[in-house]
Interface confidence: medium
């Protein structure tokens, strides 16, 4: 960056070279070349000369001011204007940084994604600040009190291996940044608790035609966990409410669910399941479609989910809106 | 001890409407659902919905959709169903009960409401 | 909707006897069975879920059994207090759904 140039001179930042987004602040540069007086100095803000709020403190040194700075990062650099020298002379560069202290982290989850060998982590880190912020994940054993700790920039996957402290823990987020330090809520977890059964996966639908026809939807999981809790939610594509089937399950062969659909009307389908009576749902599957035949019986599966159509509702699988008790709000 | 208290027996007109009340006390209230019952007199008991107190979220029975809706006050603990159009075939005892999220079994009741409506 | 038939609107017993209480579903529910007791005047209570666990404070007297479509609740050693009506449910999906109930009385 513009911090690595040879310097004839000095730049320096008031407060900082990291402060407060939204400060007032001064730059200030020390011309230190042989043989000039410098007869002016010029201040350069991302390569483009700065005209207005530039003062002359003596010879060599001048401010420049900026009220209410609000870009997170600029490449500052001033030069001199020398006599009998033809061009600018630079003097020095420094990047500079605004932003916010961080947000004291919440919603901490912890969950373990069965078959991944990991405990997941997460937490709302509360709004950007713009500048580099680092989280220190605590993990500290009820049964043994030894704590561990971990260093990462957003959420982070311990392994299970490493867990060796019994199955009772706090875990906490601590966040820091060149602006300030905060720390979230001790988190309790058990880790039987917080296990999120292998996903769920929708595998094909047949409508049977009957005195009245019905839809079968075939779904299963390859979760090893004995109690399940399902949720399937459906409805025409042209809607924009949800239908939900709840189901307590356990998947020692595949699930068939019955519908009955309206007739030539294309329908999308989702599951999300968790270990029943636990606090962690799986994000909702991805979208399954069947369209209804008119009379005739017909078979949709896998293979054949050609539909790019994707209304936003496919979750990311570390989404945390997902992964909380009280996140029912999206099935309605 | 966990109890679900209701409110009390209600008289009301054909056509009218009615909202019964599901106080709880001595749980987290915001953390289980709160499920529906009606039962009149040797028809058993059937389900009505649940809402999950926590966020305002319901799910219904089909066969009373239009009939029953499901509210929750968190300030007071308290989850209410309000029945409208009323004929005698809603004549009933009405249960409230808790059920664990994700499962769907009732482990705590209430007290019941008896409701009746006549002319 | 799944149907849940309790065959038995009444059953007659004795204090000290051994009975059982049956219910079938119209399809298989994978044991996500729970039985109630209710008696009169009263609101139900839960004794058993997924066919077999007794709920917290039951007696152990009340044993329930099954798989697929076929339930049962046993009652061993009947003791007065047991005298009252009792409802199979299904909680293998919604909407749950009872059985009519059966009512258990003396002899």
């Known amino acids: 960056g513009i911090t690595n140039i040879n310097c004839s001179g000095h730049i320096w930042v008031e407060p900082a070279t990291i402060f407060k987004m939204g400060m007032n602040i001064s730059i200030y540069c020390q011309a230190a070349i042989k043989n000039c007086q410098p007869r002016k100095l010029h201040f350069y803000k991302n390569g483009i000369k700065e005209r207005f709020q530039i003062t002359r403190i003596n010879k060599t040194t001048a401010r420049l001011w900026y009220k209410n700075f609000l870009e997170p990062h600029a490449s500052m650099y001033c030069t001199a204007e020398c006599p009998k020298h033809f061009q600018e002379t630079l003097i020095c560069g420094k990047d500079i940084s605004s932003g916010y202290p961080p947000d004291i982290p919440d919603e901490v989850t912890c969950v373990i994604y069965e078959y991944s060998g990991n405990m997941t982590c997460t937490w709302n880190a509360g709004k950007l600040t713009y500048i580099d912020t680092k989280y220190v994940v605590h993990v500290k054993s009820l049964e043994t009190e030894e704590e561990q700790q971990y260093l990462t920039s957003s959420y982070i996957n311990i392994s299970t291996d490493s867990l060796q402290g019994g199955k009772k823990y706090l875990v906490w987020v601590q966040a820091a940044n060149a602006l300030g330090m905060e720390e979230s809520k001790q988190l309790q977890i058990h880790l039987d608790d917080i296990v999120i059964p292998s996903a769920a996966v929708i595998s094909r639908a047949e409508t049977i035609n009957a005195t009245v026809p019905k839809t079968i939807i075939y779904w299963d999981s390859q979760t090893t966990i004995e109690k399940v809790s399902c949720e399937m939610r459906y409805k025409a594509t042209t809607n924009q409410t949800w239908n939900v089937k709840e189901f307590d399950t356990n998947f020692t062969y595949v699930q068939q669910s019955e519908f009955y659909l309206e007739p030539n009307i294309k329908y999308v389908f989702q599951v999300r399941c968790q270990e029943t009576g636990k606090r962690y749902w799986q994000p909702w599957s991805s979208l399954f479609f069947h369209k209804t035949p008119e009379t005739v019986p017909q078979v949709t599966s896998k293979a054949f989910q050609h539909d790019t159509w994707n209304s936003g509702l496919t979750v990311a699988s570390i989404s945390t809106g997902h992964l909380t008790s009280d996140n029912r709000g999206d099935i309605g | 001890d966990v109890q679900l208290q209701e409110s009390g027996a209600e008289l009301v007109k054909p056509g009218a409407s009615v909202k019964l009340s599901c106080k709880s006390f001595d749980y987290t209230f915001t953390s289980f659902d709160i499920n529906w019952m009606k039962q009149r007199p040797g028809q058993g008991l059937e389900w009505i919905g649940w809402i999950f107190p926590g966020s305002g979220t319901t799910n219904y029975n089909e066969k009373f959709k239009g009939k029953a809706t499901l509210t929750a006050d968190k300030s007071s603990s308290t989850a209410y169903m309000h029945l409208t159009s009323l004929t005698s075939e809603d004549s009933a005892v009405y249960f409230c009960?808790?059920?664990?999220?994700?499962?769907?079994?009732?482990?705590?009741w209430g007290t019941g409401t008896t409701l009746t409506v006549s002319s | 909707d799944i149907q849940m038939t309790q065959s038995h609107k009444f059953l007659s017993t004795s204090v000290g006897d051994r009975i059982t209480i049956t219910c079938k579903a119209s399809?298989?529910?994978?044991?996500?069975v729970a039985w109630y007791q209710q008696k009169s005047g009263q609101s139900p209570k839960l004794l058993i879920y997924w066919a077999s666990t007794r709920h917290t404070g039951v007696p152990d007297r009340f044993t329930g059994s099954g798989s697929g479509t076929d339930y049962t609740l046993t009652i061993s050693n009947v003791q007065a207090e047991d005298l009252a009506l009792y409802y199979c449910q299904q909680h293998y999906t919604t909407p749950p759904t009872f059985g009519a109930g059966t009512k258990l009385e003396l002899k």
């Open positions: 399809q298989d529910v994978i044991t996500a």
């Open positions: 009960a808790r059920r664990l999220t994700g499962t769907r079994y009732f482990d705590v």
